[in-house]
Interface confidence: medium
Amino acid sequence: MTAGRRMEMLCAGRVPALLLCLGFHLLQAVLSTTVIPSCIPGESSDNCTALVQTEDNPRVAQVSITKCSSDMNGYCLHGQCIYLVDMSQNYCRCEVGYTGVRCEHFFLTVHQPLSKEYVALTVILIILFLITVVGSTYYFCRWYRNRKSKEPKKEYERVTSGDPELPQV
């Protein structure tokens, strides 16, 4: 199948595609944490990995992280400085209530991460997203079958009776 044909198939169901995109962006908005370390809380982050998402590279990638060099002491105002090895850049892991490149901004209202409300909202949005995907797939398949049935010919015309084996030559 050509790329054009795939695109034609994907772009055909406009309403399902719109719902699909809406669901995806809602999910993305909730799960937009930039750095999610895979180190155990309280464990040394000298050498572990993290899931990173940057503005330059919107894809989530798994990278190695270590502590920043000593000359970066004090760089992060309210947080821990970590060095993203694969991306060759420093990053501040802010303390609760702080944000910004160097953890310089303070939140007046602080919610504990992964509160019950947050988990519930995430679960609801994931369910909505899955319903959207299933619904979109169903309506797309129905549309595609209807379009195919209206076509005057199959992709390959049957022109003779089937002869899988030939008679004596």
Epitope: R158, V159, T160, D163, P164, L166, V169
Partner: antibody, heavy 118, light 111 residues
Amino acid sequence: VEESGGRLVTPGTPLTLTCTVSGIDLSTFAMAWVRQAPGKGLEYIGFISLSDATYYATWAKGRFTISKSSSTTVDLKIITPTAEDTATYFCARVVGDSSGYPNTFHPWGPGTLVTVSS
Amino acid sequence: QVLTQTPSPVSAAVGGTVTINCQASQSIHNSDFLAWYQQKPGQPPKLLIYRASKLPSGVPSRFKGSGSGTQFTLTISDLECDDAATYYCQGTYYSGGWYFTFGGGTEVVVK
């Protein structure tokens, strides 16, 4: 499978060749026409399917017409013969796979010679 | 769609082996809708191989077809005097309709 109707014709005079089959019903088989100029290779002209749909080689469109005149005969009409149409014309059954998609010609008739000359 | 046969002519001694190549300018339908025919002077073509490698009943196993897509080969082993003939490959294509193309033919001379 046997062809007939080949003869000497003058340029521009339409000529119809007939392919007669025995032992098979043309409502279940496709039949093709292939020609061979003296000392040259085989050249596919076109074929007629079991549903009477006709398919022609690009070069043959508008120059030939294939039709079923009965349940046992297939005709090839050379609309406006020229000297280049001088050849032996073969009729062959189109053999399909289990899906009915065509892939082979078998069996072939002995051929009929058409000479176009003034 | 063009089928190019090489070499032509080809000669070999009795008992020998000849190989004929057939190259398609674009992929054959289903990658294997290719047939080989043998034609002797004054006779219609005779089917030797269909679906690239299948042998119809009645054709000696000395004839072997191989290949897929755009490159195909007919190999005749244990050559006999009766094998002297012209060999043609024929491909099937689909492009909004069915099309057939024959190769230019390869003459086999048996010494």
